[in-house]
Interface confidence: medium
C-alpha cells in the first residue's frame, strides 16, 4: 500500500484497462489519472466510472475526442442505453502531451481537473456509490492511476497535537494565464502531478498545485523540526519533491530523508563539519555505503537560503540544489510506493516543501 | 513548449544604458537557473550573468560585475539584464538560455545590442 | 575562474569522418562538463551533458567522454548537418566557462 487506508496505485497500466476500485467510490475520493495522449494513433480516449467489467453500467464517461476541433463529451450508461450527452467544446489534451487528469467524487458531481485546473463538472445521474471499476480505453499511455482518500493524508509536522481531519480540496481556479507543463529532464519530460504544498498554520492544512503552477509561498510561522509529512502516493517515476530553506549560522548538519515504514531509503545529509553532502540508504537500522562525490563544491552554505529539488525517476533519484545538478542516487530500495514519508531535520529552517 | 523571448536590443552610445527582457513560458519559471549568454561578432560565447528566481541569487562574469544587473520577475515570468556604463567592447548578440541542471538546454533566438558612438 | 582550452579550433573533415574535439578544463570540473553545437546566425543547442550524456533527441552519433580533465566530444560518422562550431562548457561552479570553440567545416 502507498499510504494506509487508500488504495495502492496502479502503476503503468496496460491499455484497455480495467481495474478495481477498492471498497468502491465515496465522497471526497479523489482518483488521479496520469498519462500521456498518444500521438500516432486513434481520436479519442475514454475512463469511465462503472459498475462491474461489463461497460453496460457506467455511471461516468469521459471522452475526450480529437475531432471537429477537439471536445470532450461527458455521458452516462445505464443498463447498455447512453443517455443525453454533455460536451464541453474546450479540448485540453493534446496529442503526443503528458496529462494529470484528477477526478475529484462529491455528493452532487464528479469535479474534473486536467492539469491542475478545474475543467469540467459533472453531476450525478446514477448513485455513485454503485462504482467499483474503474476503466480507461483508446489513444492514451498510462502511466499510473493513483487513489487518494482525503482522511488518511495528512500534512503532519512532527509532535504535532493538532488533529487534522481537514478533507483534501481542488485548489481554486488559478487566476491569470495557465502555463504550460515544464519540460524537466530531457530523456524524460516529467509529466504535471499532484503537489501538496505545506504550510504550518494555525490549523494546518494542505492545497493542491502543480508544478506547472510556480510555487506559492504562504506566511507561516517556522515550520517545526523535525518535520514529517506524508507523500500521496509515495514516489513514482516523475515524482518531484521541492523543499527550500535556510541554514543556521551555526550549522553542523541537516538531513532530508525519504522513508518506507522503518526504512531510509534516501538519507541527504549535508555535513558542514565535513564539507560533505553524504547520501546513504538504512535497511532495518542498518545503514549500507555512503556516497559522496560531488561535480562541483559543496553548495550548502551556513546562513544562507537553499532550495532542494529531487525528482525520482525510474532508476534513480535526481538531487538539484539551487537550480543546478548535483548527483544521482540510485535506487536501493526499488518498491517506489512504499517511499511515502518526508523526514526534514537539523540545523536548518524550513520555508517551504512541495511534495 | 518551452520558450524563451528576448527583446530590448539595440543601438546605444558608450556610456549608455540598455535593459533586455527574456520572457520565458511553458516551464516552472523559478525552479530554473536563467543565464545571459553573449557572442560578439565572429567570435565565441560568453558567459555574461544568471540568476536563479527561487531565491533571487545572482552570478556574474568579471567583465560585467557592477555594470550589469540580472534580475527577474516570477509573477511575469521574465529575467531582464540591466546593462549600464556600456563600452564598445560590451557588442555582441544576447541570448538568454535555461539553465537545465546539466547545462543549458533552451535558448532564446538572441537579441543584437550595438555599442557605438 | 576554471579556464576551458577547446583544441582544435577549427578542422575540415568529410562526410562520413570520425571527428574528435578535446577541452581541457584548468582544474577539476568532476563531470560538470557540457557540448553545444551553433550553427551561424542560430543560437547553441546541447547536445551532451554531464560530459558523457546524450541530451534528448540527439543524434547517437554524437558522444561524449572523460578522462580526468580532459573531456572529448566524439562524432562517430560526420552528417552534411553537422558542420557547425562546437563549444564545451563547465558548470561545476560560477563562473560558467565556455571553450573558445570548434569550427568543423567541409573538407
Known amino acids: 500500500m502507498a499510504f494506509s487506508g487508500s488504495q495502492a496505485p496502479y502503476l503503468s497500466p496496460a491499455v484497455p484497462f480495467s481495474g478495481t476500485i477498492q471498497g468502491g467510490l465515496q465522497d471526497g475520493l479523489q482518483i488521479t489519472v496520469n498519462g500521456t495522449v498518444l500521438s500516432s494513433s486513434g481520436t479519442r480516449f475514454a475512463v469511465n466510472f462503472q459498475t462491474g467489467f461489463s461497460g453496460n453500467d457506467i455511471a461516468f464517461h469521459f471522452n475526450p475526442r480529437f475531432e471537429d476541433g477537439g471536445y470532450v463529451v461527458c455521458n452516462t450508461r445505464q443498463n447498455g442505453s447512453w443517455g443525453p450527452e454533455e460536451r464541453k467544446t474546450h479540448m485540453p489534451f493534446q496529442k503526443g502531451m503528458p496529462f494529470d487528469l484528477c477526478f475529484l467524487v462529491q455528493s452532487s458531481d464528479f469535479k474534473v481537473m486536467v492539469n491542475g485546473i478545474l475543467f469540467v463538472q459533472y453531476f450525478h445521474r446514477v448513485p455513485f456509490h454503485r462504482v467499483d471499476t474503474i476503466s480507461v480505453n483508446g489513444s492514451v499511455q498510462l502511466s499510473y492511476i493513483s487513489f487518494q482518500n482525503p482522511r488518511t493524508v495528512p500534512v503532519q509536522p512532527a509532535f504535532s497535537t493538532v488533529p487534522f481531519s481537514q478533507p483534501v480540496c481542488f485548489p481554486p481556479r488559478p487566476r491569470g494565464r495557465r502555463q504550460k507543463p515544464p519540460g524537466v529532464w530531457p530523456a524524460n519530460p516529467a509529466p504535471i502531478t499532484q503537489t501538496v504544498i505545506h504550510t504550518v498554520q494555525s490549523a494546518p492544512g494542505q492545497m493542491f498545485s502543480t508544478p506547472a503552477i510556480p510555487p506559492m509561498m504562504y506566511p507561516h510561522p517556522a515550520y517545526p523540526m523535525p518535520f514529517i509529512t506524508t507523500i500521496l502516493g509515495g514516489l513514482y517515476p516523475s515524482k518531484s519533491i521541492l523543499l527550500s530553506g535556510t541554514v543556521l549560522p551555526s550549522a553542523q548538519r541537516f538531513h532530508i530523508n525519504l522513508c518506507s515504514g522503518n526504512h531510509i531509503a534516501f538519507h541527504l545529509n549535508p555535513r558542514f563539519d565535513e564539507n560533505a553532502v553524504v547520501r546513504n540508504t538504512q535497511i532495518d537500522n542498518s545503514w549500507g555505503s555512503e556516497e559522496r562525490s560531488l561535480p562541483r563544491k559543496m553548495p550548502f552554505v551556513r546562513g544562507q537560503s537553499f532550495s532542494v529539488w529531487i525528482l525520482c525517476e525510474a532508476h534513480c533519484l535526481k538531487v538539484a540544489v539551487d537550480g543546478q545538478h548535483l548527483f544521482e542516487y540510485y535506487h536501493r530500495l526499488r518498491n517506489l510506493p512504499t517511499i511515502n514519508r518526508l523526514e526534514v531535520g537539523g540545523d536548518i529552517q524550513l520555508t517551504h516543501v512541495q511534495t | 513548449e518551452v520558450q524563451l523571448v528576448e527583446s530590448g536590443g539595440g543601438l546605444v552610445q558608450p556610456g549608455g544604458s540598455l535593459r533586455l527582457s527574456c520572457a520565458a513560458s511553458g516551464f516552472t519559471f523559478s525552479w530554473y537557473v536563467i543565464h545571459w549568454v553573449r557572442q560578439a561578432p565572429g567570435k565565441g560565447l560568453e558567459w555574461v550573468a544568471a540568476?536563479?528566481?527561487?531565491?533571487?541569487?545572482?552570478y556574474y562574469a568579471d567583465s560585467v560585475k557592477g555594470r550589469f544587473t540580472i534580475s527577474a520577475d516570477t509573477s511575469k515570468n521574465t529575467a531582464y539584464l540591466q546593462m549600464n556604463s556600456l563600452r564598445a567592447e560590451d557588442t555582441a548578440v544576447y541570448y538568454c538560455?535555461?539553465?537545465?541542471?546539466?547545462?543549458?538546454?533552451?535558448w532564446g533566438q538572441g537579441t543584437l545590442v550595438t555599442v557605438s558612438s | 575562474d576554471i579556464q576551458m582550452t577547446q583544441s582544435p579550433s577549427s578542422l575540415s573533415a568529410s562526410v562520413g569522418d570520425r571527428v574528435t574535439i578535446t577541452c581541457r578544463a584548468s582544474?577539476?570540473?568532476?563531470?560538470?562538463v557540457a557540448w553545444y553545437q551553433q550553427k551561424p546566425g542560430k543560437a547553441p543547442k546541447l547536445l551532451i551533458y554531464?560530459?558523457?550524456s546524450l541530451y534528448s533527441g540527439v543524434p547517437s552519433r554524437f558522444s561524449g567522454s572523460r578522462s580526468g580533465t580532459d573531456f572529448t566530444l566524439t562524432i562517430s560518422s560526420l552528417q552534411p548537418e553537422d558542420f557547425a562550431t562546437y563549444y564545451c562548457q563547465q558548470y561545476t561552479d560560477a563562473p560558467w566557462t565556455f571553450g573558445q570553440g570548434t569550427k568543423v567545416e567541409i573538407k
Open positions: 554531464s560530459a558523457s
Open positions: 540568476i536563479y528566481p527561487y531565491h533571487s541569487k545572482t
Open positions: 582544474q577539476s570540473v568532476s563531470s560538470a
Open positions: 538560455a535555461r539553465g537545465y541542471w546539466y547545462g543549458m538546454d533552451y
